[in-house]
Interface confidence: low
């Protein structure tokens, strides 16, 4: 399948529009601080070059790898050293080290201004004036803020973004039409980015085997009627797609994802009965739909797992002959029978099974040794079930905002060294598990909750990795991918933490809080709550609740006052004094 010119091959496969969009995403994900215009110029140069290679694959430099071509182009940026510092040193390296170097400098939390949404009329004018630039700008702004965003999926978001403006900018009430659609895309985009970030972390930090295990479990739940060989083929192809995207090989990734969607749709009879609707859609929608498709019904009368994996006398023989294939079959068979389990739980069970076989197949009587292996699964299954039950009860009692606050206190006490913005962001997201998952019947709670928590805790891990401050976070993040959530759950209050010095400035508020949205106001209050816990880690729930209630009353009072700023200054001093007294500071 070798091509004389890789760049020509991808240009022809993807078409000019997708080629340009993907190159822009790739460049923006690497050079996150570069101005839009600089990226557009680079993309246009690459596109013109690709066209010369399409015309003549033997033309000069057309035989170079995409990493070489793109890396050379990125290294022409004049301000590389002053903007990016040591990242400029990457340009002294040869491929593939140069690309690895660029990847290592991707920043999960770039110092970029928050995206402020202009007035609807302003956006519609910009859209009509230059639709192409408007959409490119969307790709650029998302890609630079989310350097691991799944590129082919970002094309799907851009298509929906365009459709929203096309429809709404000619509606009678543009804002009523457009704003909910943009909110929807923003929320879905954040969720999509976080899910993909976990896939990349899984591949990059724990390796291909870890990712493949995850994929076997998830695809077996989703396609329980598919045979093991079919699931294995899909896993291999899916791993290639995500390895490419996570590695910055976005053209190859998008091309291979399209091929995978084509294969799935051509073979849906042997994969899943739920794919029909997805497969009637255009490419981007089709791929998205397949990725989100609901689980197929389990085949009737599946035999007991024990026969092949416990009772059979050939267990050790089969395991010894091909360990990963046998474990893969175990995972496949267990997962297809258990759509009610989270993927991470299924992986814990497979790990327990593997550990047992490693020990028992070397024992005098292997069968006697592993006969009770399924009994070891019971506590592993019950732990997340009990945790979800307890937390859903708490969520139903408190509601989302107060549930988030409970988690803020819990996690600040566990890892108080973590920065306040990170604790607020992560705890708010952890708290959303309540409204996302607790309303579901028992059979659907665990896959919803625990797999969502894996995504959120990965956000904590990647943010913490940039500036490590807590050995406990590092330990939970690096020891085991599938045990991250149990590791964080098991953390108690950090007794070694020295409380932060009290700083009145942290608790000084101004009238601008009154004009904030409800969400932003919540974040302000939650930021104050984290700071309180950092000052007084031993504060009781009742003490913290009293201070937070006072704080809410203070904000409400001053926002109703005629002279808001004076109220915030005077009442704020009283609040700080009262809070210090309440907490014994």
């Amino acid at each position: 399948d070798a091509h004389k010119s890789e760049v020509a091959h991808r240009f022809k496969d993807l078409g000019e529009e997708n080629f340009k969009a993907l190159v822009l995403i790739a460049f923006a994900q690497y050079l996150q601080q570069c101005p839009f215009e600089d990226h557009v110029k680079l993309v246009n140069e690459v596109t013109e070059f690709a066209k010369t290679c399409v015309a003549d694959e033997s033309a000069e430099n057309c035989d170079k790898s995409l990493h070489t071509l793109f890396g050379d182009k990125l290294c022409t940026v004049a301000t590389l050293r002053e903007t990016y510092g040591e990242m400029a040193d990457c340009c002294a390296k040869q491929e593939p080290e140069r690309n690895e170097c660029f990847l290592q400098h991707k920043d999960d939390n770039p110092n970029l201004p928050r995206l402020v949404r202009p007035e609807v009329d302003v956006m519609c004018t910009a859209f009509h004036d230059n639709e192409e630039t408007f959409l490119k700008k969307y790709l650029y702004e998302i890609a630079r803020r989310h350097p691991y965003f799944y590129a082919p999926e970002l094309l799907f978001f851009a298509k929906r973004y365009k459709a929203a403006f096309t429809e709404c900018c000619q509606a009678a009430d543009k804002a009523a039409c457009l704003l909910p659609k943009l909110d929807e895309l923003r929320d879905e985009g954040k969720a999509s980015s976080a899910k993909q970030r976990l896939k990349c972390a899984s591949l990059q930090k724990f390796g291909e085997r870890a990712f493949k295990a995850w994929a076997v479990a998830r695809l077996s739940q989703r396609f329980p009627k598919a045979e093991f060989a079919e699931v294995s083929k899909l896993v291999t192809d899916l791993t290639k797609v995500h390895t490419e995207c996570c590695h910055g090989d976005l053209l190859e990734c998008a091309d291979d994802r399209a091929d995978l969607a084509k294969y799935i749709c051509e073979n849906q009879d042997s994969i899943s009965s739920k794919l029909k609707e997805c497969c009637e859609k255009p490419l981007l929608e089709k791929s998205h739909c397949i990725a989100e498709v609901e689980n197929d019904e389990m085949p009737a009368d599946l035999p007991s797992l024990a026969a092949d994996f416990v009772e059979s006398k050939d267990v050790c023989k089969n395991y010894a002959e091909a360990k990963d294939v046998f474990l893969g079959m175990f995972l496949y068979e267990y997962a297809r029978r258990h759509p009610d389990y989270s993927v991470v739980l299924l992986l814990r069970l497979a790990k327990t099974y593997e550990t047992t076989l490693e020990k028992c197949c070397a024992a005098a009587d292997p069968h006697e040794c592993y006969a009770k292996v399924f009994d070891e699964f019971k506590p592993l299954v019950e732990e997340p079930q009990n945790l979800i039950k307890q937390n859903c009860e708490l969520f139903e009692q408190l509601g989302e905002y107060k549930f988030q606050n409970a988690l803020l206190v819990r996690y600040t006490k566990k890892v108080p060294q973590v920065s306040t913005p990170t604790l607020v962001e992560v705890s708010r997201n952890l708290g959303k598990v309540g409204s996302k998952c607790c309303k579901h019947p028992e059979a659907k709670r665990m896959p919803c909750a625990e797999d969502y928590l894996s995504v959120v805790l990965n956000q904590l891990c990647v943010l913490h990795e940039k500036t490590p401050v807590s050995d406990r976070v590092t330990k939970c993040c690096t020891e085991s991918l599938v045990n991250r959530r149990p590791c964080f759950s098991a953390l108690e209050v950090d007794e070694t933490y020295v409380p932060k010095e009290f700083n009145a400035e942290t608790f000084t508020f101004h009238a601008d809080i009154c004009t904030l949205s409800e969400k932003e106001r919540q974040i302000k209050k939650q930021t104050a709550l984290v700071e309180l816990v950092k000052h007084k880690p031993k504060a009781t729930k009742e003490q913290l609740k009293a201070v937070m209630d006072d704080f809410a009353a203070f904000v409400e009072k001053c926002c109703k006052a005629d002279d808001k700023e004076t109220c915030f200054a005077e009442e704020g001093k009283k609040l700080v004094a009262a809070s210090q007294a309440a907490l014994g500071l």
């Epitope: 704003l179 909910p180 929807e184 929320d187 498709v293 609901e294 996302k436 709670r445 919803c448």
Partner: nanobody, 123 residues
Framework: DVQLVESGGGVVQAGGSLRLSCAAS????????MGWFRQAPGKERERVVS????????YYADSVKGRFTISRDNAENTVYLQMNSLKPEDTALYYC????????????????WGQGTLVKVSS
């Protein structure tokens, strides 16, 4: 407290029409995708239709395409299900549900549920 209250169910002859409504309170309605599910006696609950937060995206199960129409009024915090050419197999308890994100199929993507309204189609 979040409440989803369905209304409009009843008994109708095959070939007839019904319009179900679902009034939402206690949530920011325009921030939620909405869906209608149904559960016939002795059967699993199945998604019938759903509509995205802005109303720009809709989903219909094969069994109702061309007969049912979902719409929403964000100003009134209400989602509607217009059911035409009803068949006896449409008989079920119809539930309204709300999802934080555009929900692509899994029941567990829906965060809030109504109590249901009964639709009985006689032949």
């Amino acid at each position: 407290d979040v409440q989803l209250v369905e209304s409009g169910g009843g008994v109708v002859q095959a070939g007839g029409s019904l319009r179900l409504s679902c009034a939402a309170s206690g949530l920011t309605f325009s921030s939620y995708a909405m869906g209608w599910f149904r559960q016939a006696p002795g059967k699993e609950r199945e998604r019938v239709v759903s509509i995205s937060r802005g109303g720009g995206y809709t989903y219909y199960a094969d069994s109702v395409k061309g007969r049912f129409t979902i719409s929403r009024d964000n100003a009134e915090n209400t989602v509607y299900l217009q059911m035409n050419s009803l068949k006896p197999e449409d008989t079920a308890l119809y539930y309204c549900a709300a999802a934080r994100y555009w929900a692509t199929g899994s029941e567990y993507e829906f965060d809030y549920w109504g109590q249901g309204t009964l639709v009985k189609v006689s032949s």
